[in-house]
């Protein structure tokens, strides 16, 4: 329960806080658990204790191990354990899972990525930020205090973000890097596979030869503003514009509506002066978005005009 995992890279600074808390006036003793050897407090040592903090300036792979901290007060002692692992620097860009701090989620409204563990260090702004090992450039990215702000967050902003800063100890500078994953969630709504409400799959629509007919393709795509969603008609698997029959036209623009809070689109296909050959065509209502594409097919059948003779 009072054990904490800490990790760092060789030749970087690593500062670890004792998992057991106490008042600043309480003394904290640190030991290397394997040997029970006391950690010195003199700052001239590469590894030294400073109250609740254990400092590796800089860290070495051989420093890996379990460290014991004992918080001493006049009335009690509290013991904690810091499990420290120092890794060799990776030669390639890949940041392994074991070097990752907790994943954070962001959205269009809230896109702060905090630099992990930075509050333990003596650092000065600005922080440097990298995404998937590339330095972040452009006005959308703003390094602010101990966090990164991304303006107009998009799904493409998801990835691994590394912050890099300098820890200063008695005039000496040490580099520190920390990486965490960032995922993007849409606060406004969500996106689904298209759900075609009309027409029904393999619907047969009765039409009168010589009269006009309308077919409506209607589909819903999720909640809130939808990015890249469309409904359209095809004739025998061909775009209406490419089919080359001027009597058959798609309504210009798509009508947007909201059904039970869902964002829906509809597109009307207008057939002027229905002819016999129109009954042989396959009419496909297509609904598509980033998730995918769904199609419902309609065919026309002849509706016999009502006999008005007495």
């Amino acid at each position: 329960k009072f054990s904490k995992q800490s990790w760092g890279l060789e030749n970087e600074a690593l500062i670890v806080r004792c998992p057991r808390q106490g008042k600043p006036s309480y003394t904290v003793d640190w030991y290397y658990s394997q040997t029970n050897k006391s950690i010195p407090t003199q700052e001239r040592n590469r590894v030294f204790a400073s109250g609740q903090l254990l400092k590796f300036l800089p860290a070495a792979v051989a420093d890996s191990g379990i460290y014991t901290c004992i918080v001493r007060s006049p009335t009690f002692n509290r013991t904690g354990y810091a499990n420290v692992t120092i890794y060799k620097k990776q030669s390639d860009c890949n940041v392994p899972d074991y070097l990752m701090y907790s994943t954070v989620s962001g959205s269009e409204k809230n896109s702060k990525i905090y630099c992990p563990t930075i509050d333990l260090y003596n650092w000065t702004a600005p922080l440097e930020w990298f995404k998937n090992c590339q330095a972040l450039q452009g006005s959308r990215y703003r390094a602010h205090k101990s966090f990164l702000v991304i303006d107009n967050v998009m799904t493409e902003d998801a990835g691994d973000y590394t912050c890099k800063f300098i820890h200063n100890e008695n005039g000496a500078n040490y580099s520190v890097t920390a990486t965490r994953s960032f995922t993007v969630k849409d606060e406004q709504g969500f996106s689904l596979f298209p759900v075609i409400g009309a027409p029904a799959q393999n619907e047969i629509k009765e039409v009168e030869i010589g009269k006009n007919a309308n077919l409506t393709c209607s589909a819903c795509f999720g909640k809130g503003t939808q990015f890249l969603a469309a409904v359209l008609w095809q004739l025998n698997g061909t775009k209406i514009t490419d089919f080359g029959e001027p009597r058959i036209q798609q309504e210009e623009g798509q009508n947007q509506s909201f059904s039970n809070g869902l964002a829906c689109l509809d597109m009307v296909l207008r057939i002027a002066d229905v002819k016999e050959e129109d009954l042989l065509l396959q009419y496909d209502c297509l609904a598509l978005n980033l998730h995918g594409l769904r199609r419902h097919t309609v065919r026309l059948s002849r509706k016999n005009p009502i006999d008005h003779h007495s």
Partner: antibody, heavy 120, light 107 residues
């Protein structure tokens, strides 16, 4: 007949990128979604993402977001999948698969697969 | 993400046997479930789509059933060419996810 023909096997170094192609024939390329699915040796199937050529915009599984790029060239009826920052765990057979006509989330036609080996 | 769990992971059967493979989704996926067959060194092949519809060209001994979270693939009379690995796949939402597979071996 309808078929998807993929590019040949690749051997890559960790940290590098690979681009696999998938040439479609026998159907109207723009009318169908194209998916990419991978299968590590002795393992199951894993969806990476896909693209609707008439949109030209891809959808990726979160796991691959930022590392994978799927594109489509209508003029040659070819889809491409590029995976960057390769690691040994990316060693797998990579398949392109056509989405179904009525529902693009079914994989009705598959390419023969491209073996990508990542090794130092 | 929707998790798909297949059982059993492998089974041994004889030619002529009736074989049943089950697939469970971590949440309701209506009838958005597909089944695939894969033979060693080959690409998967679509057998059943929308839980129960037989893909064109697939023998009628294959059938699918179920909706919501529980689905079944049945081979009514196992043939020599049916020894393969079978995967279920949900097509309800992205990321599209597969079950771990069921290997059907000769007893």
């Amino acid at each position: 007949q309808v078929q998807l023909v993929q590019s040949g096997a690749e051997v890559k170094k960790p940290g590098s990128s690979v681009k696999v192609s998938c040439k479609a024939s026998g159907y109207t390329f723009t009318n169908y979604y194209m998916h990419w699915v991978r299968q590590a040796p002795g393992q199951g199937l894993e969806w990476m993402g896909g693209i609707i050529p008439i949109f030209g915009t891809a959808n990726y599984a979160q796991k691959f977001q930022g590392r994978v790029t799927i594109t489509a060239d209508e003029s040659t009826s070819t889809a491409y999948m590029e995976l960057s920052s390769l690691r040994s765990e990316d060693t797998a057979v990579y398949y392109c698969a056509r989405g179904g006509y009525y529902d693009s989330s079914q994989f009705d036609i598959w390419g023969q697969g491209t073996m990508v080996t990542v090794s130092s | 993400d929707i998790q798909m769990t297949q059982s059993p992971s492998s089974l041994s059967a004889s030619v002529g046997d009736r074989v049943t493979i089950t697939c469970r989704a971590s949440q309701s996926i209506s009838s958005y479930l597909n089944w695939y067959q894969q033979k060693p060194g080959k690409a998967p092949k679509l057998l059943i789509y929308a839980a129960s519809s037989l893909q064109s060209g697939v023998p009628s001994r294959f059938s699918g059933s179920g909706s919501g979270t529980d689905f079944t693939l049945t081979i009514s009379s196992l043939q020599p060419e049916d020894f393969a690995t079978y995967y279920c796949q949900q097509s309800y939402s992205t990321p599209l996810t597969f079950g771990g597979g069921t290997k059907v071996e000769i007893k």
